[in-house]
Interface confidence: low
Amino acid sequence: RTVPPMVNVTRSEASEGNITVTCRASGFYPWNITLSWRQDGVSLSHDTQQWGDVLPDGNGTYQTWVATRICQGEEQRFTCYMEHSGNHSTHPVPSGKVLVLQSHW
């Protein structure tokens, strides 16, 4: 069976002038997935991103995330790329108020 992921992009305050953007994929099966941040369509190097483990979510499916830190005001240049079981999609950073959340960094 194949269950496609739900992808959600969020943003949180990181430090003065910077935000952390996090791309979360959940509810997918099988567990093999590619998540990566892109700037102006070009993949960021892996050392500028942080990945969460692929973990079971208790429903027979899996979840994971990837995060990166970017300059506030440049959100429109960044997208999250997802590839799973032959399907792929890109997800922009949402506009709007920055949420103050616990950072992964």
Partner: antibody, heavy 119, light 108 residues
Framework: QVQLQESGPGLVKPSETLSLTCTVS????????GHWIRQPPGKGLEWIGM???????DYNAAFISRVTISVDTSKNQFSLKLSSVTAADTAVYYC?????????????WGQGTLVTVSS | EIVLTQSPGTLSLSPGERATLSCTAS???????LHWYQQKPGQAPRLLIY???NLISGIPDRFSGSGSGTDFTLTISRLEPEDFAVYYC?????????FGQGTKLEIK
């Protein structure tokens, strides 16, 4: 049956452009990405770059000023162009498929084609 | 760049013996992005193990992988004649995405 086949000139003159094509079958380049890797005679493997399923590219910084990887999904082909070649670019060039979820690993490879740079 | 150093350079063993191949990274590599390939003379490499320890379908279970951080290991529990080849580790953790120099596994 998944197959990849490299093609192109076996001899390229110094300062010219090396052009290779990888023709794939058994899968679609709209759902799988592709890599180019090379191996100088008697030496190890060197990653050149890759093309993602939506056409974006990632390159090894060592080649970035002279490499272009492109895709023609209608022909199920992706291509490598390496400009301003020297004798140091003599190698067996491989194309490979980026496996789904294999964290950029290359799950199928072409048999390789030897390109010699010589005048 | 991350340099992958494989050891030993050449390993001479007999069929039936256990082979342990090492791959040491110059800086930490995520286990998700460390892969192993096998290459026989005149052939293209083939993927054996991805993400440190995941065996590719069709690869015999005498092959296994382990490790984390900077130290990774490929183990062949009981060597068969067809296992004698060159083995490469490969990291896709940081660009450029490098290979080790290879370990040649030869018949003693």
């Amino acid at each position: 049956q998944v197959q990849l086949q490299e093609s192109g000139p076996g001899l390229v003159k110094p300062s010219e452009t090396l052009s290779l094509t990888c023709t794939v079958s058994g899968f679609s380049l709209t759902t799988y990405g592709g890599h180019w890797i090379r191996q100088p005679p008697g030496k190890g493997l060197e990653w050149i770059g890759m093309i993602w399923t939506d056409g974006w590219t990632d390159y090894n910084a060592a080649f970035i000023s002279r490499v272009t990887i492109s895709v023609d999904t209608s022909k199920n082909q992706f291509s490598l162009k390496l400009s301003s070649v020297t004798a140091a670019d003599t190698a067996v060039y491989y194309c490979a498929r980026k496996g789904h979820g294999y964290y950029y690993a290359m799950d199928y490879w072409g048999q390789g084609t030897l390109v010699t740079v010589s005048s | 760049e991350i340099v992958l150093t494989q050891s030993p350079g050449t390993l001479s063993l007999s069929p039936g013996e256990r082979a342990t191949l090492s791959c040491t990274a110059s800086s930490s590599v995520s286990s998700s992005y460390l892969h192993w390939y096998q290459q026989k003379p005149g052939q293209a490499p083939r993927l054996l193990i991805y993400s440190t320890s995941n065996l590719i379908s069709g690869i015999p279970d005498r092959f296994s992988g382990s490790g984390s951080g900077t130290d990774f290991t490929l183990t062949i529990s009981r060597l068969e004649p067809e296992d004698f080849a060159v083995y490469y580790c490969h990291q896709y953790h940081r660009s450029p995405f490098t290979f080790g120099q290879g370990t040649k596994l030869e018949i003693k």
